[in-house]
């Protein structure tokens, strides 16, 4: 044996953004040879493992929230760990509103900014584009939950959606957003590339999107303080549907 | 409560051979990771060998490795260590320790110790 | 040679507050894995004090502390007592062959 095995994958199904109460399972794919695997929590102060390649939650709750990474040994010899997973439970806090300004249907070459507002004093905003398979590149500046598009293309087209949370409790994150349908107008675009179908929020956790743009905002209001105990974060907590005062 | 009792140390020879067993009681022995580790006179602790809870996950120090095999019998609460071709630096206590467990996830750390089994590897 | 590295010896009057270090690396405690502390007794086995970094097990006085930052922790512990003199372990866990660790232990000495 000369050096590590090489490291395994470790894959969500369907998705890594799991709403509360939804399954998902956790998979180590390594090679066909692979003896045996080990998967593990990786919290500070509650590192855990289980000798399994897989994991399946059956009904997603707030303390299964976190990173996750894997290895798995051949004839004794251990591999490379996993690059890390992170498992982000949706639907904690209530929808963050996404709105385009100055409109959502732009014509090409403007500027328009998508702008998340939560309820609540976080932190953290990010905005996810259907579909895409890459990360859009960062703006050089933030504007608190602003995501400034600067020259609109044709491709920028598409349904987008936003959600916040507390950089305190980085893996617990609100419910999505509203689709946000934004349409380029004008003799660049196309039809394929106007949606012609809002798809239902109920199938957020079997589509994989891809991060666009993460926001993390400066202000002078002091940002909420989340504790997060085995029982679930403290204050605010809740599904979708439940509201609260803004924080102080 | 929690009880581990090892037995099976004693005088052997520059290359001989020993068996160590741990009789666990008072928790569910087949639930948990069982590992051994090792004290010589005066110095420090030394982690020997582990095994997961239903006996298929088996790790080894690489100053054991090839000498010494770990076991366990869950029907009979028991672990094991058989440790062959011993050498003087193997002189030892021998403690058996059990690792923490939470619903279905181990923990990296040892919650309780039995009061360990003197291995004496001299000519 | 131990993988993590402790303070062979430590003391301190009755009353006053000692600290051990433990120091890893990347592939222990930077690598995320936690850092537990053991307390040896005299001609006893040794028994846990702290896990997780810095829970203590019930039975355990609130006078022992531990943090961890980076690739090293520490315990602390406040108002010393004769009865706290003991060796003292840290140990963790290597992700390269998935190995317990310990450190070589520190000897606590209560003056006086």
């Known amino acids: 044996q000369h050096g590590p095995l090489p490291k395994p994958s470790l894959q969500a199904q369907p998705s890594s953004l799991v709403p509360l109460g939804h399954p998902v399972t956790l998979r180590c794919l390594g090679p066909s040879d692979a003896d045996l695997y080990r998967l593990e929590k990786v919290k500070p102060g509650k590192l855990i493992f289980i000798d399994q390649d897989f994991l399946f939650i059956p009904i997603m709750e707030i303390n299964n929230a976190g990173r996750y990474r894997c290895s798995y040994q051949n004839e004794s010899h251990w591999s490379l760990p996993s690059d890390q997973l992170e498992l982000i439970a949706t639907g904690v806090y209530s929808k963050p509103s996404l709105s385009a300004h100055p409109s959502s249907a732009i014509p090409p070459g403007r500027d328009v900014t998508l702008k998340c507002q939560s309820q609540y004093s976080f932190d953290e905003f990010v905005l996810y584009k259907e579909g895409d398979t890459r990360p859009y590149k960062r703006p050089e500046k933030w504007y608190r939950a602003n995501f400034p598009v600067i020259t609109v293309t044709a491709a920028h087209s598409g349904t987008y959606r936003c959600y916040s949370f507390s950089s305190s409790s980085p893996y617990l994150w609100s419910a999505p957003s509203d689709p946000l349908v934004v349409v380029v107008t004008g003799p660049s675009a196309t039809p394929s590339q106007v949606p012609t179908e809002v798809p239902s929020p109920m199938t957020e956790a079997s589509r994989r999107p891809s991060m666009l743009l993460t926001n993390k905002i400066s202000t002078t209001e002091k940002p909420m303080n989340i504790t997060v105990s085995p029982e679930g974060p403290s204050p605010p907590f809740g599904f979708a549907h439940q509201h609260y005062a803004k924080g102080n | 409560q929690v009880q581990l009792v090892e037995s099976g140390g004693g005088l052997v020879k520059p290359g001989g051979s020993l068996r160590l067993s741990c009789a666990a009681s008072?928790?569910?022995?087949?639930?948990?990771?069982m590992s051994w580790i090792r004290q010589a006179p005066g110095k420090g602790l030394e982690w020997v060998s582990s095994?997961?809870?239903?006996?298929?996950?088996?790790d080894y120090a690489a100053s054991v490795k090839g000498r010494f095999t770990i076991s366990r019998d869950n029907a009979k609460n028991s672990l094991y260590l058989q440790m062959n071709s011993l050498r003087a630096e193997d002189t030892a206590v021998y403690y058996c320790?059990?690792?923490?467990?939470?619903?279905?996830?181990?923990?990296?750390?040892?919650?309780?110790w039995g009061q360990g089994t003197l291995v004496t590897v001299s000519s | 040679q131990s993988v993590l590295t402790q303070p062979p010896s430590v003391s301190g009057a009755p009353g006053q507050r000692v600290t051990i270090s433990c120091t890893g690396s990347?592939?222990?405690?930077?690598?995320?894995?936690?850092v537990h502390w053991y307390q040896q007794l005299p001609g006893t086995a040794p028994k846990l004090l702290i896990y997780?970094?810095?829970n203590r097990p019930s039975g355990v006085p609130d006078r022992f502390s531990g943090s961890k930052s980076g690739t090293s922790a520490s315990l602390a512990i406040t108002g010393l007592q004769a009865e706290d003199e003991a060796d003292y372990y840290c140990?963790?866990?290597?992700?390269?062959?998935?190995?317990?660790?310990f450190g070589g232990g520190t000897k606590l000495t209560v003056l006086g």
């Open positions: 320790a059990r690792h923490y467990r939470e619903f279905r996830w181990h923990y990296y750390y040892f919650d309780y």
């Open positions: 997780g970094n810095s």
């Open positions: 990347s592939s222990n405690i930077g690598a995320g894995y936690d």
């Open positions: 140990q963790s866990h290597d992700l390269g062959a998935h190995v317990w660790v």
């Open positions: 008072g928790f569910s022995f087949s639930d948990h990771y």
């Open positions: 095994v997961g809870s239903e006996g298929k996950f088996i």
